[in-house]
């Protein structure tokens, strides 16, 4: 017999996780596991447990984490990796619309997202959207172009700005962005 | 809200001892890495002492201290203590108590500050000769 499914990995409630802030990464395998193993990749960390709860986070907790787990002396597959994220390590961007927040349907617009440091990657979020929009940029702005605007589009965006050095520490997020389709 | 709180740091003639105190709220204590690191304006922050719970409570002290110093926890009173003997000029520095999530796999890893999450304020201790 082959090895046993991987578990799932989740960050509760939001891998995104501002300074100082609680949250808790949850490993889940098949009911009656033996042990669990849940690692912080390239740092030589782990715990034997399948929940790791973290009163506050710092940037030394920032990172990548999978986790697998034990029956008998067979182990898993490793979960996919959970990229856990520090925000409000770094003062927060602006975010503007070009040419203005409010769009007909059909219509283009450019989301920018502006910082006065060097950082190189941009990330967008649509309040609601589990993944965002990721952008490297050799200047300081990133652009996001919305091309053929729907209704779906319609929303609160923020954005982050980061350093491809440090990939897990952003900045605070934008003020938000609200894009309004007529 | 995590806090580390250390005392029991002061002026102390050479040869004497010194005990510090580190105690530990807001986190998960008997499961937590506990750590004694020290700095010297100018330098980096170095390694002293780490106790881990891990196979009953695993020691580990800098080259620099051994068999003059010694750490020690209570788990019940969510305290990490560092017993300093032989004191000499040369351990006059801020020393901070420090806090893990996560045990060590790899040997080093406990003497690397970034393996390290949360940190006290510090209490300075200073030998005079």
């Known amino acids: 017999s082959g090895p046993l499914p991987k578990p799932s990995l989740q960050a509760l409630p939001s891998s995104l996780v501002p300074l100082e802030k609680p949250v808790t990464l949850r490993c889940q395998g098949p009911p009656g596991v033996d042990l669990y193993r849940l690692e912080k990749l390239s740092s030589s960390r782990y715990q034997d447990q399948a929940v790791l709860f973290i009163p506050a986070m710092k940037r030394s907790l920032a990172g990548r984490y999978r986790c697998s787990y034990q029956n008998g002396s067979l182990w898993s597959l490793p979960s996919d990796q959970l990229e856990l994220v520090a925000t409000g390590v770094f003062a927060k961007p602006s975010l503007s619309a070009q040419p203005g927040p409010a769009v007909s349907s059909g219509g283009d617009v450019t989301l920018q997202c502006q910082t006065r440091y060097g950082f190189d990657q941009f990330a967008l979020y649509k309040e609601g959207d589990p993944a965002p929009y990721k952008n490297p940029e050799r200047w300081y702005r990133a652009s996001f172009p919305i091309i053929t605007v729907t209704a779906a589009h319609s929303g609160t965006y923020r954005c982050y700005s980061f350093s491809s050095r440090d990939p897990y520490l952003w900045s605070a997020p934008s003020d938000p962005l609200e894009l309004v389709v007529t | 809200q995590v806090q580390l709180q250390e005392s029991g740091g002061g002026l102390v003639q050479a040869g004497g001892s010194l005990r510090l105190s580190c105690a530990a709220s807001?986190?998960?204590?008997?499961?937590?890495?506990m750590a004694w690191f020290r700095q010297v304006p100018g330098k980096e922050r170095e390694f002293v002492a780490v106790i881990s719970t891990e196979s009953g409570g695993r020691t580990d002290h800098a080259d620099s201290v051994k068999g003059r110093f010694l750490i020690s926890r209570d788990n019940a009173r969510h305290m990490v203590y560092l017993q300093m003997n032989s004191l000499n000029p040369e351990d006059t520095a801020v020393y901070y108590c420090a806090s893990s999530l996560l045990y060590c796999s790899a040997s080093g890893c406990y003497a690397n500050r970034d393996s390290y999450d949360y940190w006290g304020q510090g209490t300075q201790v200073t030998v005079s000769s």
């Open positions: 807001g986190v998960t204590f008997d499961s937590a890495a």
